[in-house]
C-alpha cells in the first residue's frame, strides 16, 4: 500500500488457513423459529458417521434438538441457541460444514415487498452484544507503513445498546497515550489513528459490553518503518499472456512503496523499424497513468478489451517514487480465434474470450 492511504482492517478479506470452508454460512433466525442446518456429503459421496458440535461441544439429541447425519434441527429456537455450529466427521473430526447462527428476539417476519408498511419494527434484539456483520470480522493482522491512517471497526448491537471501549496490549487505551491522539467514533464503532509510528505497534482490542454480556475482538498492528528505497514490484507480475483474437486481457502489477508511488503502464513500439532510440532508450507509448480520480489499486491493473493482433507485444509496468524507478515487463501473444487453445507457456495464462 502506498503512503498516506487509509488502512481499514475489519472486512478486508483475509486468507483462511486450512481447508477452504466453502460451506460456511452466517444465518439469522427469529425467536421461536426452527433452526434447520443441512450438510450434504462432499462430492455427493457417502457421509460416514458424523457429529454435530455447537461452540466446540458435542450436541446432545433431545425432543427439541433433532440430530441426523446430514441435518440438524433445533425447534423453538431462543437466544441461547445462537453460536457456531459445525458438522464433523466422527473419526477424523474434519469439519464438513460450518454455520454461524444468530437467534434474535424478533420473530422473523415476511418481506414487505413494496415498503408500504411504515410501522416501527418493535422486535429489537434484546440481550448480550453481537457483531452485526460477523462475516466481516475475519482479519486479525494488519501491517502498514509508517505515516498511514489506521481504522479498526467493531460494529455491534444488543439491547440495551452496548458500549465500546478499546485496549492496547490489554490496557485501557486513551488519546493521551499517543502523540496525535486518537479518534473514537462510537456510533461507527471505530478507532482511528492518523499518521501511525512504530510505537503504535501492538494488540488492539475492542470490548463491546452491556449488562447481559461482553464480546471482544483483537487486532494486531505492525507499523513498517520507512525505508528509503525505490518501489518494489512483486515477482512474476505482470505475467506473460496468450490470448485469442477478440478476447479480454488483464495485466497485474503489485507495487510496494513507502513513498507515494507513481505508476504507469507502457507499451513498447517501433519507430522507423527501430525499438530503441539513439541513446538506447526503448520507444514506448503511455497506456495508463494517474488521473484525478484514479486510485493506486486501479493503476495496478491494465485491462485490454477485444484484443487485436496490433495489441501483441511487450508491456511494462513502471513505478517510481522520490527515490527511484522500478519496472517489470511481460509479453502478450495474440492468436487467431479459430485456434483451439489448450495451454499456454509456463509463465502465461490463456483467455478464451
Amino acid at each position: 500500500e502506498s503512503l498516506g492511504t487509509e488502512q481499514r482492517v475489519v472486512g478486508r478479506v483475509a486468507e483462511v488457513s486450512g481447508p477452504e470452508p466453502s460451506q460456511q454460512e452466517q444465518l439469522v433466525f427469529g425467536s421461536g423459529d426452527a433452526v434447520e442446518l443441512s450438510c450434504p456429503p462432499p462430492g455427493g459421496g457417502p457421509m460416514g458417521p458424523t457429529v454435530w458440535v455447537k461452540d466446540g461441544a458435542g450436541l446432545v439429541p433431545s425432543e427439541r434438538v433433532l440430530v441426523g447425519p446430514q441435518r440438524l434441527q433445533v425447534l423453538n429456537a431462543s437466544h441461547e441457541d445462537s453460536g457456531a455450529y459445525s458438522c464433523r466427521q466422527r473419526l477424523t473430526q474434519l469439519v464438513l460444514c460450518h454455520f454461524s447462527v444468530r437467534v434474535t428476539d424478533a420473530p422473523s417476519s415476511g418481506d414487505d415487498e413494496d415498503g408500504e408498511d411504515e410501522a416501527e419494527d418493535t422486535g429489537v434484539d434484546t440481550g448480550a452484544p453481537y457483531w452485526t456483520r460477523p462475516e466481516r470480522m475475519d482479519k486479525k493482522l494488519l501491517a502498514v507503513p509508517a505515516a498511514n491512517t489506521v481504522r479498526f471497526r467493531c460494529p455491534a448491537a444488543g439491547n440495551p445498546t452496548p458500549s465500546i471501549s478499546w485496549l492496547k496490549n490489554g490496557k485501557e487505551f486513551r488519546g493521551e497515550h499517543r502523540i496525535g491522539g486518537i479518534k473514537l467514533r462510537h456510533q461507527q464503532w471505530s478507532l482511528v489513528m492518523e499518521s501511525v509510528v512504530p510505537s503504535d505497534r501492538g494488540n488492539y482490542t475492542c470490548v463491546v459490553e452491556n449488562k447481559f454480556g461482553s464480546i471482544r475482538q483483537t487486532y494486531t498492528l505492525d507499523v513498517l518503518e520507512r525505508s528509503p528505497h525505490r518501489p518494489i514490484l512483486q515477482a512474476g507480475l505482470p505475467a506473460n499472456q496468450t490470448a485469442v483474437l477478440g478476447s479480454d486481457v488483464e495485466f497485474h502489477c503489485k507495487v510496494y512503496s513507502d513513498a507515494q508511488p507513481h505508476i504507469q503502464w507502457l507499451k513498447h513500439v517501433e519507430v522507423n523499424g527501430s525499438k530503441v532510440g539513439p541513446d538506447g532508450t526503448p520507444y514506448v507509448t503511455v497506456l495508463k497513468t494517474a488521473g484525478a480520480n484514479t486510485t493506486d489499486k486501479e493503476l495496478e491493473v491494465l485491462s485490454l478489451h477485444n484484443v487485436t493482433f496490433e495489441d501483441a507485444g511487450e508491456y511494462t509496468c513502471l513505478a517510481g517514487n522520490s527515490i527511484g524507478f522500478s519496472h517489470h515487463s511481460a509479453w502478450l501473444v495474440v492468436l487467431p480465434a479459430e485456434e483451439e487453445l489448450v495451454e499456454a507457456d509456463e509463465a502465461g495464462s490463456v483467455y478464451a474470450g
Epitope: V16, E20, T132, R133, T161, Q188
Partner: antibody, heavy 118, light 107 residues
C-alpha cells in the same frame, strides 16, 4: 477502471435453475466482498447475500437461503449466483456489487434480467 | 430484519432547489446508512456511506446526515441530471436492507 460485467438476459421455464455470472476486472478481486441484489420490476432492492472471494465463505439473507447459491472462481475473477426451483416470482433484474469493509456497494454490475415463463 | 422506510415515494423539485430525502430505520443503525442514485435502465450508484461520507467522485452538492433511526440525503442545488430514484440502505447489520425508494421529479 473497475468493471463488473454480468452475463446476458435469460428466459427460463418454471422449475428450472439458472446460473448468473459476474466477471470482475480493474481491481484485485480478493480485496472485496461480492454482494448480490434482486430488483423486481418497479420495486425496490433486496439483498440476497455475499461471498468472500478468498475462501468462499457466504452469508445469505434468510429469505434467499433456499433459492440462491453463491460461488466464486478466483482464477477467472468471476462470481456466480445459481437460482433454483424458479417461479415467476423470481423474474427480476439481478445485480452483483462489490463492497470493502462495511462501506456500501461502491461498484455494481450492469444487471442481468431473468424472466421465468412457460 | 431492519425495515428502512422512505416516507415519500415521489418528491417534486425545480432545478436549483434544495431538497431533502428522508429515511427512517425501524431500529438504531448506528449511522450505518448508505444512499444510492438509480436512473432508468441503469444500475444504482453509491453516493453516501456511513450516513455522511461522500463516495469518491460524488459532487459536493450531495450531503448525508443523521443518526440513530433518522437519516437525510440533501441535494443542495438540484441539477437536471439529479432527477432519479434514490434508495437508502442500512449496511450496519445483516441482512442488509433497502428503503422502497424516493423518485425525484420536476415540478
Amino acid at each position: 477502471e473497475v468493471q463488473l460485467q454480468q452475463s446476458g438476459p435469460d428466459l427460463v421455464k418454471p422449475g428450472a435453475s439458472v446460473k448468473i455470472s459476474c466477471k470482475a476486472s480493474g481491481y484485485t478481486v480478493t480485496d472485496y466482498y461480492m454482494n448480490w441484489v434482486k430488483q423486481s420490476h418497479g420495486k425496490s432492492l433486496e439483498w440476497i447475500g455475499d461471498i468472500n472471494p478468498n475462501n468462499g465463505v457466504t452469508t445469505y439473507n434468510q429469505k434467499f437461503k433456499d433459492k440462491a447459491t453463491l460461488t466464486v472462481d478466483k482464477s477467472s475473477s468471476t462470481a456466480y449466483m445459481e437460482l433454483r426451483s424458479l417461479t415467476s416470482e423470481d423474474s427480476a433484474v439481478y445485480y452483483c456489487a462489490r463492497e470493502e469493509d462495511f462501506d456500501g456497494f461502491d461498484y455494481w454490475g450492469q444487471g442481468t434480467t431473468l424472466t421465468v415463463s412457460s | 430484519d431492519i425495515v428502512m422506510t422512505q416516507s415519500h415515494k415521489f418528491m417534486s423539485t425545480s432545478v436549483g432547489d434544495r431538497v431533502s430525502i428522508t429515511c427512517k430505520a425501524s431500529q438504531d443503525v448506528s449511522t450505518g446508512v448508505a444512499w444510492y442514485q438509480q436512473k432508468p435502465g441503469q444500475s444504482p450508484q453509491l453516493l453516501i456511506y456511513w450516513a455522511s461520507t461522500r463516495h469518491t467522485g460524488v459532487p459536493d452538492r450531495f450531503t448525508g446526515s443523521g443518526s440513530g433511526t433518522d437519516y437525510i440525503l440533501t441535494i443542495r442545488s438540484v441539477q437536471a441530471e439529479d432527477l432519479a430514484l434514490y434508495y437508502c440502505q442500512q449496511h450496519y447489520s445483516t441482512p442488509l436492507t433497502f428503503g422502497a425508494g424516493t423518485k425525484l421529479e420536476l415540478k
